[in-house]
Structure formats: structure tokens, C-alpha cells
């Protein structure tokens, strides 16, 4: 009888674990959907505002090829930095290549010096994988140096010419990025 009760208890516990996993997956999926929705809104806002503006990038933004970059003069934690970029119809910087990284670090050297700037890179809590905000993985040469010993969520930032990692709840400058307006001439 006791063995039967113990077996039932174990089965119930197993069921509970499965349900918790399902809930966790659903929460992640929901978060991902919400983020993609924000991306679409940012993209739309960018397209609409660009339509009324003839220059490829807004004032105080830097252009490089098809991208416009904004280097903040304010400090935020990583999540607030992302929200700040979204308000501007942009997203936190996503570095696609070494060439882009070199452009960013070169520009930072000229305007600000050796400060920390959040970019759109964060570590997935479950898998430990690094992901850009659109869900893609960074190329092998653009993985942050494992500097953070934080037990909290870890996010990526640029300093000097390096990509580093840190607790997402610390205050740093940040860099936003959006598409440059194509000339209609």
C-alpha cells in the first residue's frame, strides 16, 4: 500500500515538473512574440518617420552603409536601454561583422573615449547561448569575453575595441541602431 502511494506521488511530481517546463516554454515564447511585435513597431515607426525626412539618418545619429547609430549620453540598465531605443524607432545595436565592430569602436574612440555601451546581446538563461535581440546567434568572432561572474542575467556591451559581458542590471551608456533611409533620387 505504501509503495503504491509512493509511486503515485512520484508520478504526480513528474507531471508537475512537465507542467512547469511547459509553462516555462510558453513564457519564453510569449516573451519572444512580444519582442518581435516591438521590433515590427520600431521598424514601422522608422519607415514612417524616414518618409518625412530626406537625410539618411536623424540628427545626432552616425551613418555607416545602410545603418544609422545613436550613441547615448545617458545611463540605463540593459532592459531600459532597449526600451529607449524602441522609443526612437530603433533597437539596441546588433553587430553583424568585424567591419561593423571596427566602425563602432573607431567612432566611439573619436566621440567618447573608453566607456561601456550596452548592445543588443544577452545570454539565454536556460541554454547559456548568446543571442541578439532578433533571436539570431552572434558569429564566432563576435562572442563576448567571459568576464561576468554574475548569478543574474548577463548581457553584452562594447568597451574600447572589445565585446564584454556584465550583469544586465548595471548602468551603462548604450548604442541604438536603425536602417538608414535610402535616397529616392
Amino acid at each position: 500500500k505504501l509503495l503504491q502511494v509512493s509511486t503515485i506521488a512520484m508520478q504526480q511530481q513528474e507531471k508537475l515538473i512537465q507542467q512547469e517546463r511547459a509553462l516555462l516554454n510558453f513564457t519564453e515564447w510569449k516573451r519572444s512574440c512580444a519582442l518581435q511585435m516591438k521590433y515590427c513597431q520600431a521598424f514601422m515607426q522608422n519607415s514612417l518617420s524616414s518618409a518625412h525626412n530626406s537625410s539618411p539618418c536623424p540628427n545626432n545619429w552616425i551613418q555607416n552603409r545602410e545603418s544609422c547609430y545613436y550613441v547615448s549620453e545617458i545611463w540605463s540598465i540593459w532592459h531600459t536601454s532597449q526600451e529607449n531605443c524602441l522609443k526612437e524607432g530603433s533597437t539596441l545595436l546588433q553587430i553583424e561583422s568585424k567591419e561593423e565592430m571596427d566602425f563602432i569602436t573607431g567612432s566611439l574612440r573619436k566621440i567618447k573615449g573608453s566607456y561601456d555601451y550596452w548592445v543588443g546581446l544577452s545570454q539565454d538563461g536556460h541554454s547559456g547561448r548568446w543571442l541578439w535581440q532578433d533571436g539570431s546567434s552572434p558569429s564566432p568572432g563576435l562572442l563576448p569575453a567571459e568576464r561576468s561572474q554574475s548569478a543574474n542575467q548577463v548581457c553584452g556591451y562594447v568597451k574600447s575595441n572589445s565585446l564584454l559581458s556584465s550583469n544586465c542590471s548595471t548602468w551603462k551608456y548604450f548604442i541604438c541602431e536603425k536602417y538608414a533611409l535610402r535616397s529616392s533620387v
Partner: nanobody, 126 residues
């Protein structure tokens, strides 16, 4: 944009006191939160203390609770940080910061964005 001018930093013996001041200009001072951050070499930037626009709400880093007091004088556009019982681990550059308009709700200092000042060095010798 806000301009911030810190003063009051310096060298002090462990157990001693210092009072940092920060004068703000360029915006109506009494409408936004103010804070003090600090950064020691090789360490992350920490929020030491913050105060709401009215002075009605304050927040302190665990390591300074009971030793540091943040206050503001809206008639003088100035925020203060009174630091008592200073320890060697309080050595850092201290930055005054002004809340970015509309970035935080009353008392929600962690969700806010901040305009930083230039910083003032505080060194505590043991």
C-alpha cells in the same frame, strides 16, 4: 539637457565624513529624481543613493544604509550626499545623476535612465 557640477570629494581617513554636493542647471530641478552613483576601478557602476523629485522617496545601496544620507534642496537646485563612517571600500569616483524626463515613475529608480555628471574622486585611506 541637464548640466551637473559635483563638488566635495577628496581624501579622508577611514571612519571620517564627507559631504558631496551637486548643483544642477538647464531644467526645472524640482520635477525630476536625482541620484548618486559610484564606480571603483575595475568594478561595476553602482547606484549608491537616489531621491525622488519631492524628496519623499529615497533608496540606498545595501552597503551604505545607515551611513550615507541623500537629500535635496529644490530652492538651491542642489542634491547632497552626506557620507559618514567611511570605509576603504567606499573609495571610488562618485557621480551625480539626474533622471531623464519621464523615464521612471515616482520611486522606481532602477527603471529610470540617468544623465551623469563628470564625477568627483573620493579616497578613503585606512
Amino acid at each position: 539637457q541637464v548640466q551637473l557640477q559635483e563638488s566635495g570629494g577628496g581624501l579622508v581617513q577611514a571612519g571620517g565624513s564627507l559631504r558631496l554636493s551637486c548643483e544642477a542647471s538647464g531644467r526645472t530641478f524640482s520635477t525630476y529624481a536625482m541620484a548618486w552613483f559610484r564606480q571603483a576601478p575595475g568594478k561595476e557602476r553602482d547606484l549608491v543613493a537616489a531621491i525622488s523629485w519631492s524628496g519623499g522617496s529615497t533608496e540606498y545601496h545595501d552597503s551604505v544604509k545607515g551611513r550615507f544620507t541623500i537629500s535635496r534642496d529644490n530652492t538651491k537646485n542642489t542634491v547632497y550626499l552626506q557620507m559618514n563612517s567611511l570605509k576603504a571600500e567606499d573609495t571610488a569616483v562618485y557621480y551625480c545623476a539626474a533622471e531623464v524626463e519621464g523615464s521612471g515613475r515616482e520611486g522606481n529608480f532602477y527603471g529610470a535612465s540617468w544623465y551623469p555628471g563628470q564625477g568627483t574622486q573620493v579616497t578613503v585611506s585606512s
